[in-house]
Structure formats: structure tokens, C-alpha cells
Amino acid sequence: HSDGIFTDSYSRYRKQMAVKKYLAAVLGKRYKQRVKNK
């Protein structure tokens, strides 16, 4: 079912982004985010 495939794909993408965030905390970022002026 296409909805199920989409849901699974989106779920995996969200997990991938979470892993990327955790790895970035270990490896550091090439470009550090600048604090925006309010």
C-alpha cells in the first residue's frame, strides 16, 4: 500500500535526521550556526 510505504520512508528519514544530529554533536559542525539578532 502506497501510504504505508510513504509512512515507512518518512519514519526512516526522521530517524536518519536524528542520527545525523547525534553524530554532529560528536564530530562537530563545519559551519556553526550564527545566533540571529532578535
Epitope: 526512516r12 542520527v19 547525534y22 553524530l23 554533536a25 564530530l27 562537530g28 559551519y31
Partner: antibody
Framework: SVEESGGRLVTPGTPLTLTCTVS????????MSWVRQAPGKGLEWIGI?????ITYYASWAKGRFTISKTSTTVDLKMTSLTTEDTATYFC??????????????WGPGTLVTVSS | AIKMTQTPSSVSAAVGGTVTINCQAS??????LAWYQQKPGQPPNLLIY???DLASGVPSRFSGSGDGTQFTLTISAVQCEDAATYYC??????????????FGGGTEVVVK
């Protein structure tokens, strides 16, 4: 650049500390890993010191290997050495998140020989 | 802990031919995979990172593909200087143990 030192011939059970000296960049900005290679064998990941100063180790290395750092060095402390630990030990600078291949650096390695 | 299984352990190729090396991860590592070339007496040299990105200075005959658990390094139009041992390295994150990494067992490429 990165360069390892401290490798030598030791007897089984002897502790040994290897040092990775870095120049041209800050350890605050890069994670550093230790990798080893037994003679004629493959590469084996030991552990990593993150930019957050948290260390992670391969399951087989936990408890016997310890990674620490100063402002310009990353040390690998090894205890209870056995002949199985005979290898060339490499220090490597890791690629940052959103970084490129120029981030990756390997030292020439330092040879540790454990023999009675 | 993550485990990387690399095949074949050795492969022979003629100059101008194509070599394919496979690497399988024990868990989903997304695209967190690198390939290295190592020649005797030298440290490894990065070829591919993030599964398919070519490292700077590496000839375009080297290419990487894959995502998840299955990855491939392809060497097209093999040259004599490509004779070396090739390794994959995967990186994973576990909620239990955090950062983890492992290398494949290596593939020796012999060029005829």
C-alpha cells in the same frame, strides 16, 4: 598535521600510552579517532574523542583502552597488553558534519610490539 | 555493535577492466560509510565518504553507491596503480552505546 608517537617493544601486561600530536588546527573543532592494524591484517577501529569531549569505544576496547586529550595532543592509554595488541596504531582526524574530504587526516602510525 | 562484512576478500582485474567491491552493514547506517585505499607501508587514503561523495584528488574512475545496509565501491577502467587493499568503514549511532564504527575485512585488488 597529525603524528603518533610512543610505540615501542613492551612485555605482556605492561601499560603503554601513545600520543597523537596535532598542529595547524584546534582539537576543539575536530573529533579524533584511534585505529590499529596488526601486521598483515585489516584495520580495526578503537575509539573516538568527540568535540564534545565524550569518548566512545569499540566493545572489545572498553575498559582496557582510554582516550584523553590536552590542547594539542590526543592520548591512547592501553593496559594489560597482550601479543594480540601488536599493531601499528593510527591517529585520525574525522570529517565534520557538513564537512568535506579535506577534513580527514591520518598520521603515519606508530608501531607497538608486545612480546616476551 | 556494528559489524561490516566486505566481499570479496581478493579480486583480480585486467588493466582497463572493472572491479566491484561490496560492503554489508549489520544494521541500517543510512549513508554513513567511507571507502579507503591502502598500499603497503602507508596509512589508508580516503576515496569515498558519505557512501557516494568522491574525496578531493581522487580519480573519477572510483565511485561509491548504496544506502542502509548494502554498499558498493566500483573501480572503472582499472589502472596498475589501483593495486592495493580497499576497506569500507561504517558509522552508526545507538541509543544504548552511542557512537560506533567498524571496518570491513578488506579487499585485495590485484591488477594483471
Amino acid at each position: 598535521s597529525v603524528e603518533e608517537s610512543g610505540g615501542r617493544l613492551v612485555t605482556p601486561g605492561t601499560p603503554l600510552t601513545l600520543t597523537c600530536t596535532v598542529s595547524g588546527f584546534s582539537l576543539n573543532n575536530y573529533a579524533m579517532s584511534w585505529v590499529r592494524q596488526a601486521p598483515g591484517k585489516g584495520l580495526e577501529w578503537i575509539g573516538i574523542m568527540g568535540v564534545n569531549d565524550i569518548t566512545y569505544y569499540a566493545s572489545w576496547a572498553k575498559g582496557r583502552f582510554t582516550i584523553s586529550k590536552t590542547s594539542t595532543t590526543v592520548d591512547l592509554k592501553m593496559t594489560s597488553l597482550t601479543t594480540e595488541d601488536t599493531a601499528t596504531y593510527f591517529c585520525t582526524r574525522e570529517i565534520r558534519d557538513d564537512g568535506d574530504s579535506s577534513d580527514k587526516l591520518w598520521g603515519p602510525g606508530t608501531l607497538v610490539t608486545v612480546s616476551s | 555493535a556494528i559489524k561490516m562484512t566486505q566481499t570479496p576478500s581478493s579480486v583480480s582485474a585486467a588493466v582497463g577492466g572493472t572491479v566491484t567491491i561490496n560492503c554489508q552493514a549489520s544494521e541500517d547506517i543510512y549513508t554513513n560509510l567511507a571507502w579507503y585505499q591502502q598500499k603497503p607501508g602507508q596509512p589508508p587514503n580516503l576515496l569515498i565518504y558519505d557512501a557516494s561523495d568522491l574525496a578531493s584528488g581522487v580519480p573519477s574512475r572510483f565511485s561509491g553507491s548504496g544506502d542502509g545496509t548494502q554498499f558498493t565501491l566500483t573501480i572503472s577502467a582499472v589502472q596498475c596503480e589501483d593495486a592495493a587493499t580497499y576497506y569500507c568503514q561504517g558509522v552508526a549511532w545507538s541509543s544504548n552505546t552511542g557512537y560506533g564504527s567498524a571496518f570491513g575485512g578488506g579487499t585485495e585488488v590485484v591488477v594483471k
